[in-house]
Amino acid sequence: GYKAEVMVSQVYSGSLRVLNRHFSQDLTRRESSAFRSETAKAQKMLKELITSTRLGTYYNSSSVYSFGEGPLTCFFWFILQIPEHRRLMLSPEVVQALLVEELLSTVNSSAAVPYRAEYEVDPEGLVILEASVKDIAALNSTLGCYRYSYVGQGQVLRLKGPDHLASSCLWHLQGPKDLMLKLRLEWTLAECRDRLAMYDVAGPLEKRLITSVYGCSRQEPVVEVLASGAIMAVVWKKGLHSYYDPFVLSVQPVVFQACEVNLTLDNRLDSQGVLSTPYFPSYYSPQTHCSWHLTVPSLDYGLALWFDAYALRRQKYDLPCTQGQWTIQNRRLCGLRILQPYAERIPVVATAGITINFTSQISLTGPGVRVHYGLYNQSDPCPGEFLCSVNGLCVPACDGVKDCPNGLDERNCVCRATFQCKEDSTCISLPKVCDGQPDCLNGSDEEQCQEGVPCGTFTFQCEDRSCVKKPNPQCDGRPDCRDGSDEEHCDCGLQGPSSRIVGGAVSSEGEWPWQASLQVRGRHICGGALIADRWVITAAHCFQEDSMASTVLWTVFLGKVWQNSRWPGEVSFKVSRLLLHPYHEEDSHDYDVALLQLDHPVVRSAAVRPVCLPARSHFFEPGLHCWITGWGALREGGPISNALQKVDVQLIPQDLCSEVYRYQVTPRMLCAGYRKGKKDACQGDSGGPLVCKALSGRWFLAGLVSWGLGCGRPNYFGVYTRITGVISWIQQVVT
């Protein structure tokens, strides 16, 4: 029998340029009579144009919703009711071609054409895009708070905040032709639930979403987003009611930046430069295409690309890359944002060099990508270290910590976390190396102690990049480096003259002069440690709650012993900057470290002094007894302590701790404590120092109180942020 044809609604969005009209400010106000009359005329013209083509039979409805510069640009949407089997045949490209063809056919015609009665439409200025019913609904919900802004070349336009009576607003932004718009979003409140979405077109088309941000992101307090061209839309959706705008938006047109480079690398190892997407650290724009050609000086070298919080992965089934597509020597890889460092190593097989292409495959983009490039020796990619094939990084081998996710850096070790004697491969503990007493059969542990040696897992790297064999040579009163750099920055780690309480757990004034108390509204929240004249280190998880993220809330006390009283040695500071480790992950506690910049430098005294920071190669030997200090609870679930408490804890081998915590212990963690429980850190100690005393008598920061199962529970250790695992970031920030 007869079967009715199934019809489907196909939605299109677009814009057209009118050459014989000019844009005026009146047209930005939807309530103005100018807007109403222009809309009526433009709507009539649009309907007539569509119905003049073979699309006319499918015409359902249309709307002109906005105007812009150029001389006059009309922004519209329309719906066609199409037989289902024709759906794919009427793509936006086909519809655009049909409408352009119609416009061209009447350009020189003297016959009266209804849609040309008032408007001279530029065929070249017609754009048709795919849209959906959902997109139109989203657009309509913003029309009560719709702002159009044109921003000229060289201008930076600060956008007027949203109308708080509305639940949603749209900023329609336009810049000069041939330029691209750069939008800057700065969150100004610590906490909010507002949502902002940026689009690469005039309206909220889901398929042209560049990015969306939500809720006063602390990870990205400032976001810069690039459109692919001169048009952009920003949609705001209200979160919690607030009288203050939780963000500031500004926009500026910028010129297209070429992203093509030819480089010839020097005959040396390590990083030689940086490649980045245009306007880094801005988000890369939709339709970004970068092509970098690097020439390597010899086939002995491979090319290394070091990424920060971004990795390259093979993508199955030719699915589009959502975070950037890379082609390297005809291999297709997809970018992936991760909270880890990563390196891609490219073996070089021909002198022709290597071409690296980066493309944004979809309109959805993300933070700009920056990559350091350099050479590595193909026959020995990681001198003195282990090449972790999982992430391309060079990691210490046989140091007792599985730095590589597959643990291969700790496999097949003759001597793990010890020194291997040359004579017979016996293992001796590291503190015995270069201590003036031969422990190996023929004394190989005391050889080469006064000269440079190849860098390795436990060697110390001097400032001139040479390495010394003696483990932990920092600040021991004897220069071991030729340049003396192992004895620089040594005004640290000394306790003040203190009257110790023998056998007690209460600390005395000046005993732990680096100890900090981090307080909010007079209440102790976390511990910390002074590491430089203006820097205190603590745990990132202290700022986990949005309400704790603002620097203005915090006061840092140094030289403090008692919480309920002040004494003359005590000083307090406000916080001018708060930096969480960029790889910090709340769920796993990985990279649990933060740095607070004090509002003024400390004046050192017997009660206020920094602790020494270890070098990356510093070895805190498992078994060593170290100390934790803090005002944390004296029992699980109890109130914080009034007096600064101290307790000695033993450092635990990583594998043993990892077993206890079911392999949740990462290489940036360190374990200490007792199986019997009893001695441990507790709530309120977080961020406080775990310090170990070197033979020189100086105290080095080994860890920060991070997490653990309960407090002092039997069979569970305390887990600390391993300072040697995050030291490069600390040094980068502090210096």
Epitope: S429, P431, G503, E621, P622, G623, L624, H625, Q650, I652, P653, L656, A672, G673, Y674, R675, K676, P714, N715, F717
Partner: antibody, heavy 120, light 107 residues
Amino acid sequence: QVQLVESGGGVVQPGRSLRLSCAASGFTFSYFGMHWVRQAPGKGLEWVADISYDGSDENYADSVKGRFTISRDNSKNTLSLQMNSLRAEDTAVYYCAKETYQSLMYLEYWGQGILVTVSS
Amino acid sequence: AIQMTQSPSSLSASVGDRVTITCRASQDIRNDLGWYQQKPGKAPKLLIYTAPSLQSGVPSRFSGSGSGTDFTLTIGSLQPEDFATYYCLQDYNYPWTFGQGTKVEIK
């Protein structure tokens, strides 16, 4: 390569004293708690005493309390057991043993043992 | 002091047999218990710690279980080198105390 070597054993008359020593090598002695355990001929094991890594804490079996003293010299990597007022029932092989990490406190490594005979 | 009672005091078994030794504490000791193996004229060797944890290098045929007051050492399939005396040791409280030992002999 952990090695524990006991010395100082022998035959002694009841009421007299004897000092046992244990020389440790192959590990950082000052990090670990140390123990003495004994075994009378043909009998089971009996825990005698232990000392913490820094010498600040000692514990004894009731049978030796007040007569035996455990001590250590971390600079010489040596553990000692001073045995006074010896009795016939103190006759045994004496083992020195090293704890694993204090967080675990198991007797991981043992010396080969030294015989002490208390007899008139 | 906490008393540790081991049973049986001796047992005869053949190669390939499954052997179970039990240890009972006179009070709750959580899981603070280790198992040691001693061969004639030799020092004891740690097999199991914290009741169920196998010391590294010890064959997986040895296993420990239990907590509170009742503990078990199981040898899944007895091998010729397993004929020895086995002791449990509580380290929950001072003074530490051993069980009286279980001698495993060839049938």
